[in-house]
């Protein structure tokens, strides 16, 4: 807005005013009169660009008149008072109200003074983000979905992740006329490493003070990935019990663990305890390949480990894991 004291009477108004669909909005418009300057305002007029006639007029002697009396109101102009504030309130904002408006003061002896204001009709979108639960496909698939519903103008959606991925964004008309629903899919080749990781959907819109961040926890369904731990290649006769653990990562969780050997069932010195296998002390050397088979809803996977129990005295720092 221009600084005061410029000599001429000046109409002050913002260049753009935002309003929300269905709500009311005030288009501010004031006459700035320099000190000592005498001016007389006989009429205030609001007109919309591209339309003939005025939408609102306030006359010094006749008061207000409106093209749509239920939707328009001068907020400060009063009969018998100095007309310096032409601010106009609009009720029940519609999409078609968006556009350029002219606020005009008829002043004497300075002449008519006007300013243009752009009314922006906004609709605040509702935002949701959800995981798209997937299985291992070997192909890029949507793994997360972010939806901004009923925005005007359309919201901007971006994805933030350390995992890579590609967005695929589309728009469709919203439920209310003039609004838009934006859907963005985050696409990646599923892998077990991605399961449980987070991606963030960022939604930006004129109506937001700051971007909205929605976090999605990724879900990849995959069969068990199995390994056996607890053996260090230094097991000797006469040592204490040792424990092997069948380590399984899977989604959903494993439903069963089955221990066996390549020769068939477990030997007497090996006792299965769910995911663990207890190896009791033995009195003669062993060379056996153990198998752990893990099952979940998507299938079964197994790991093998060849265990040797050797002759010879164990040193202090070697041997099987002790209880």
């Amino acid at each position: 807005w221009p600084p005061p004291g410029t000599g001429d009477v000046v109409v002050q108004a913002p260049t753009q005013v935002p309003g929300f669909l269905g709500d009311s909005v005030t288009l501010p418009c004031y006459l700035q009169v320099p000190n000592m300057e005498v001016t007389h305002v006989s009429q205030l007029t609001w007109a919309r660009h591209g339309e003939s006639g005025s939408m609102a007029v306030f006359h010094q002697t006749q008061g207000p008149s409106y093209s749509e009396s239920k939707r328009l109101e001068f907020v400060a102009a009063r009969l018998g008072a100095e007309l310096r504030n032409a601010s106009l309130r609009m009720f029940g904002l519609r999409v078609e109200d968006e556009g350029n408006y002219t606020c005009l003061f008829v002043t004497f002896p300075q002449g008519s003074r006007s300013v243009d204001i752009w009314l922006r009709v906004l609709a605040k979108p509702q935002n949701t983000a959800e995981v798209q639960k997937v299985q291992l496909t070997g192909e890029p698939v949507p793994m997360a979905r972010c939806v901004s519903t009923g925005g005007r103008p359309p919201a901007q959606i971006t994805w933030h992740s350390d995992l890579g991925g590609m967005p695929n964004t589309s728009q469709v008309p919203g439920f209310l006329s003039g609004t838009v629903t934006v859907t963005s899919l985050w696409i990646l080749v599923p892998s077990s490493q991605v399961d449980g990781k987070n991606v963030t959907c960022k939604v930006e819109h004129e109506s937001f003070e700051k971007p909205q961040l929605l976090t999605v926890n990724l879900t990849v369904y995959y069969p068990p990935e199995v390994s056996i731990s607890g053996y260090d290649n230094n097991w000797y006769l006469g040592q204490n019990e040792a424990t092997l653990t069948c380590d399984a990562r899977s989604n959903p969780e494993p439903t069963g663990y089955n221990w066996s050997t390549t020769m068939g069932p477990l030997p007497p010195f090996a006792v299965a305890q769910g995911a663990q296998l207890l190896i009791r002390p033995v009195d003669k050397p062993i060379n056996t390949t153990l198998i752990c088979n893990v099952t979940n809803a998507l299938g079964a996977r197994q790991a093998e480990l060849t265990v040797q129990v050797k002759e010879g005295p164990p040193s202090e720092h070697s041997g099987i894991s002790r209880n």
Epitope: G7, D8, P34, M36, E37, V38, H40, S42, H59, Q60, T61, G80, V106, F108, P109, Q110, G111, S112
Partner: antibody, heavy 121, light 109 residues
């Protein structure tokens, strides 16, 4: 057409008052600004005041404040200027002038024929 | 009060161009003085020509134009006609009152 018809010539003694009328026709009187201007013999023009006919809002030249009163009668579309405590240097032709608007600016559009006021003892 | 000064008289040939000026004793004339120009032909009523520095009144021939010229208001007559012979007054607005100039007698000869 737009016309301003003023009252006839006046001869007044010093200290007296005079009230000059200006009857408008051909336009919406209540939406108009009317200025009063005078021209002393052999002199240029001197602006006295303006009035907004619709409300009676006025703005006076400080030189005349306290001695001049402008009024309107909207029922007869007539503007009045009363000048009190007349002196000999108030002898002049008094004009009413309606201001017209070009949209961006105002101008002295239509003038009355003038009323001669003579102040003489 | 401010004093507004005009050329007492100017002469222009028919078809010629002449510029009448209006100077303010308070300094440069600006658009905030809303310069007005008024014409008075002998034996006729006054007639407004220009308002707000450069806005021509309806019905006024295009040969009349108002402007600011340096630190003065100006009325330029391009292609003068014999019927333009008249007295021309300017009026300037000073925040709360108008001040008229002494007038310029324009002769078309």
């Amino acid at each position: 057409q737009v016309q301003l018809v003023q009252s006839g010539a006046e001869v007044k003694k010093p200290g007296a008052s005079v009230k000059v009328s200006c009857k408008a026709s051909g336009y919406t009187f209540t939406s108009s600004y009317i200025s009063w201007v005078r021209q002393a013999p052999g002199q240029g023009l001197e602006w006295i005041a303006w009035i907004y006919a619709g409300t009676g809002d006025t703005n006076y030249n400080q030189k005349f404040t306290g001695r001049v009163t402008m009024t309107t009668d909207t029922s007869t579309s007539t503007a009045y200027m009363e000048l009190r405590s007349l002196r000999s240097d108030d002898t002049a032709v008094y004009y009413c002038a309606r201001h017209g608007s070009t949209g961006r600016g105002w101008y002295f559009a239509v003038w009355g024929q003038g009323t001669t006021v003579t102040v003489s003892s | 009060q401010a004093v507004v000064t005009q050329e007492p008289s100017l002469t222009v040939s028919p078809g010629g161009t002449v510029t009448l000026t209006c100077r303010s004793s308070t300094g440069a004339v600006t658009t905030s003085n809303y310069a007005n120009w008024v014409q008075q032909k002998p034996g006729q009523a006054f007639r407004g020509l220009i308002g707000g520095t450069n806005n021509r009144a309806p019905g006024v021939p295009a040969r009349f134009s108002g402007s600011l010229l340096g630190d003065k208001a100006a009325l330029t007559l391009s292609g003068a006609q014999p019927e333009d012979e008249a007295e021309y007054y300017c009026a300037l607005w000073y925040s709360n009152h108008f001040v008229f100039g002494g007038g310029t007698k324009l002769t078309v000869l």
